[in-house]
């Protein structure tokens, strides 16, 4: 390893500010990638990383292109991916990412899905459908023109799918309340059966959300098809048109036919043979997480390593798993010492009031991102419903039926299923199954046991206790728990089931169907109380209003989590309230939010993260 002239931070509680965003990934994924990239270094050195919302941060993170405000312009696609400055004041310590790159998780463009049977999982490219390979969303197998994708590598085998961002699901901004396009629609007396840029000078595609724009004046902007936006060729920035004709043959996805180098391309009109318009299809992109982890190494004081396997080696290569090599660890520990426990503690967050994650840079009529809010719930306009009609229906080969699906297997950040010894110290637990404030004490659940944490002097920690002894009906593994602050009823969730305890009396298990949650909701990540017997119910990046009395969600209320809670991990596995703050847990960490008590106000005032910390050190107050 090499260090940079001995430069390092003179404190161990490092703050960072995400100044702006790339449109290649949803904001919550970008937030998560950066948090994970910092956590890589926090795992092996006594450093903590706290997100703040202003330029006083130690590390300011910025996406930019070409000349972007420092003396080191970026170089367009590929080549230089990002750069970072060594520790110090001002621009020193900052990390800049070239937004001419395609930022992904390292495996291609990230396309979130809607409806279907995959609970919002991103598309898997390439995927196989009816024996053919697809590297972009497709309308094959459907007669309504709605693009879809498989969320696993093989749709034929797994049958897992979702719908891609499309104007047939929803529109963005405008005044059409997010409703889907209505095709055909009338504009200036003419009929349009696709999104158009007519009437606009900025090139943004739009449509009417009723059959007659001239009469109703209702419209929205059409979501960008990131999976099909070409680069290079002679049509950069245009969309692939599927199907297209090339040498007399019809193609429904990107192809490498006609090329010696194997690169995938598509036509941007329906007939390449006549129009000769084409571009390259999006590639695998660069893992924002891996590049950020490398850049943050620089921002902490590490120079490049000569060890090819090291994260700090100057060449990008995609890898999975923990990215640090012994050389990286030796380098960061040379600078900051050994151990991963925060020393000193994470700082109190910035005294300035948290700002929105990024100020709007365009007028609100312009769609800012390819990753819009969750589509509107099904209505008479004909957005697909998550019933059998909404699936790709290829005919006799077997249309998928979006019935109950098995819960996804736990990822590396989710709880293990090893049995817990009662003697085990909760400070050794990496990830708790559930955390909830019950009867004034914070309860930490893990594999059929729980601890109680009383926030006062003396011996605040009690347990472990057997969960089944206190709440006999419950399974060993929980997803979340919640106490209704008014009635003191305690709700427990595991998989697609819910139990409600009133004292020692239990109601349940009840299926999530009974709550009005469809089969795509495989678990509940948590609830947050709201006034008047209401709560917010969270699952996999989405949030519903939940009536605690009727125990039903309002299906019209579903929105993406980041629309109400900016900057929290989209895949938080546990969400709870404690001392009037909301906590969103992911892995070992929590994101704390000071939230307003009203939700879904017309202006959607977004609640802001005010602290990030360790569950064990900061909540359990482990040594």
């Amino acid at each position: 390893f090499q260090t940079f002239k001995g430069l390092k931070w003179d404190h161990h509680n490092i703050t960072y500010w995400i100044q702006n965003y790339s449109e290649d990934l949803p904001r919550d994924m970008i937030d998560d990638a950066f948090a994970r990239a910092f956590a890589v270094w926090g795992e092996v050195a006594p450093l903590t990383f706290t997100r703040v919302y202003g330029p006083e941060a130690d590390i300011v993170i910025q996406f930019g292109v070409a000349e972007h405000g420092d003396g080191y312009p970026f170089d367009g696609k590929d080549g230089l991916l990002a750069h970072a400055f060594p520790p110090g004041a001002g621009v020193q310590g900052d990390a800049h990412f070239d937004d001419d790159e395609l930022w992904s998780l390292g495996k291609g463009v990230v396309i979130p899905t809607y409806y279907g049977n995959s609970n919002g999982a991103p598309c898997h490219f390439p995927f196989t459908f009816e024996g053919r390979s697809y590297s972009a969303c497709t309308t094959d197998g459907r007669n309504d023109g709605t693009p879809w994708c498989s969320t696993t590598a093989d749709y034929d085998k797994d049958g897992k799918f979702g719908f891609c961002p499309s104007e047939r699901l929803y529109t963005e901004h405008g005044n059409g309340e997010g409703k889907p396009c209505v095709f055909p629609f009338i504009f200036e007396g003419r009929s349009y059966s696709a999104c158009t840029t007519k009437g606009r000078s900025d090139g943004y595609r739009w449509c009417a959300t009723t059959a007659n724009y001239d009469q109703d004046k209702l419209y929205g902007f059409c979501p960008t098809r990131v999976d099909a936006t070409v680069v290079g060729g002679n049509s950069a920035g245009e969309l692939c048109v599927f199907p297209f004709v090339f040498l007399g043959k019809q193609y429904s996805s990107c192809t490498s036919d006609g090329r010696r180098d194997g690169r995938l391309w598509c036509a941007t009109t329906s007939n390449f043979d006549t129009d000769k318009k084409w571009g390259f299809c999006p590639d695998q992109g660069y893992s924002l997480f891996l590049v950020a982890a490398h850049e943050f190494g620089h921002a902490l004081g590490l120079d490049h390593s000569s060890v090819p396997e090291a994260l700090m080696y100057p060449l990008y290569s995609y890898l999975e798993g923990f990215p640090l090599n012994k050389d990286d660890i030796d380098g960061i520990q040379y600078l900051y010492g050994r151990g991963s426990k925060p020393d000193p503690r994470p700082p109190a967050t910035t005294t300035t009031e948290p700002q929105p994650t990024a100020p709007p840079t365009m007028c609100p009529t312009i769609p800012p991102t390819a990753y819009p809010t969750v589509g509107p719930t099904v209505g008479p306009t004909g957005a697909p419903s998550p019933g059998p009609t909404s699936s790709p229906s290829p005919g006799p080969t077997g249309a998928p039926s979006p019935g109950p699906t098995a819960p996804p297997t736990a990822g590396s950040s989710e709880a293990s299923t090893e049995s817990l010894s009662p003697a085990d110290n909760p400070c050794n637990v990496d990830v708790f199954d559930a955390i909830a404030e019950i009867q004034g004490a914070l309860h930490f659940f893990k594999d059929g046991w729980y601890w109680k944490f009383l926030n006062h002097r003396g011996s605040p920690l009690q347990g472990p206790f057997l969960t089944a002894r206190t709440w006999p009906a419950l399974p060993a593994t929980l997803d979340s728990a919640f106490e209704d602050p008014q009635t003191k009823r305690v709700f427990f969730f595991s998989g697609r089931q819910m139990w409600v305890y009133t004292g020692k009396t239990v109601l349940g298990p009840r299926s999530l169907d009974k709550l009005g949650l469809g089969p795509e909701v495989t678990h509940v990540s948590g609830l947050l109380p709201r006034r008047l017997g209401k709560a917010l119910l969270f699952s996999k990046g989405r949030v519903w209003r939940f009536d605690l009395k009727s125990q039903k969600v309002d299906p019209q209320s579903v929105i993406r989590v980041d629309k109400e809670f900016s900057g929290v991990p989209w895949n938080s596995h546990d969400i709870f309230q404690y001392q009037d703050k909301a906590y969103f847990c992911h892995g070992k960490f929590f994101w704390r939010v000071s939230f307003q008590n009203e939700v879904n106000k017309v202006d959607h005032e977004v609640n802001q993260v005010d602290d990030v910390g360790y569950v064990t050190y900061d909540l359990l107050q482990c040594p």
Epitope: F4, K5, L7, E67, G69, D70, G71, Y72, P73, D75, G76, D78, G79, L80, L81, A82, H83, A84, F85, P86, G88, A89, G90, V91, Q92, H294, E295, H298, D303, H304, P314
Partner: antibody, heavy 123, light 107 residues
Framework: EVQLLESGGGLVQPGGSLRLSCAAS???????DMWWVRQAPGKGLEWVS????????FYADSVKGRFTISRDNSKNTLYLQMNSLRAEDTAVYYC?????????????????WGQGTLVTVSS | DIQMTQSPATLSLSPGERATLSCRAS??????LAWYQQKPGQAPRLLIY???YRATGIPARFSGSGSGTDFTLTISSLEPEDYAVYYC?????????FGQGTRLEIK
């Protein structure tokens, strides 16, 4: 030992063309940003152009559209194609190696320079 | 573009004296400043990078300081071989720019 050796200078009429070369040795040429900097007689230093390892190029406003920088990493050679030359382009042209490389931006400075080649534009 | 202003234009000092050369940027450039020495008929030579770090092989009598907009090159005790023109160069913002130079001559 790092060495940079320019060639290709000479006398040229206004509107004419010249191609400068800079042969590099003693370091991994393909990893570094390479620059052309010029100095008019009795004047100070002025940057002309830079080329990144990826081939991306930048130019001073005064030469944009007339000069083209390029590199051949297999030959460890940097080039400057100068077209539509003007009297004010008369100068000693130096090639210079950036001290830094890649994405760690702090090592500011040109740590090695060629000896320079004189370009005279005159009728 | 950022303007770099060096002062004085000419500095006349005797061997053994201390030389202080100034460079001012028209806006903040953090510490992205380099100093070069150029002797007649020769190419410039890097002395100081990042405002205060001596380049390889540069004698300890040369030192750099400053950040933001004001920078100083100090030669603690002048040697006969130090008489030359000195340039500062910024890379705090694009494009890079050089100062007009300070001529250090024997008094």
């Amino acid at each position: 030992e790092v060495q940079l050796l320019e060639s290709g200078g000479g006398l040229v009429q206004p509107g004419g063309s010249l191609r400068l070369s800079c042969a590099a040795s003693g370091f991994t040429f393909s990893q570094y940003d390479m620059w052309w900097v010029r100095q008019a007689p009795g004047k100070g230093l002025e940057w002309v152009s830079v080329i990144y390892p990826s081939g991306t190029t930048f130019y001073a406003d005064s030469v944009k559209g007339r000069f083209t920088i390029s590199r051949d990493n297999s030959k460890n050679t940097l080039y400057l194609q100068m077209n539509s030359l003007r009297a004010e382009d008369t100068a000693v042209y130096y090639c210079a190696k950036d001290r830094a490389y890649g994405d760690y931006v702090g090592w500011n400075g040109f740590d090695y320079w060629g000896q320079g080649t004189l370009v005279t534009v005159s009728s | 573009d950022i303007q770099m202003t060096q002062s004085p234009a000419t500095l006349s000092l005797s061997p053994g004296e201390r030389a202080t050369l100034s460079c001012r940027a028209s806006q903040s450039i953090s510490s992205f400043l380099a100093w070069y020495q150029q002797k007649p008929g020769q190419a410039p030579r890097l002395l100081i990078y990042d405002a205060s770090y001596r380049a390889t092989g540069i004698p300890a009598r040369f030192s750099g300081s400053g950040s933001g907009t004001d920078f100083t090159l100090t030669i603690s005790s002048l040697e006969p071989e130090d008489y030359a023109v000195y340039y500062c160069q910024q890379r705090g913002n694009w494009p890079i720019t050089f100062g007009q130079g300070t001529r250090l001559e024997i008094k």
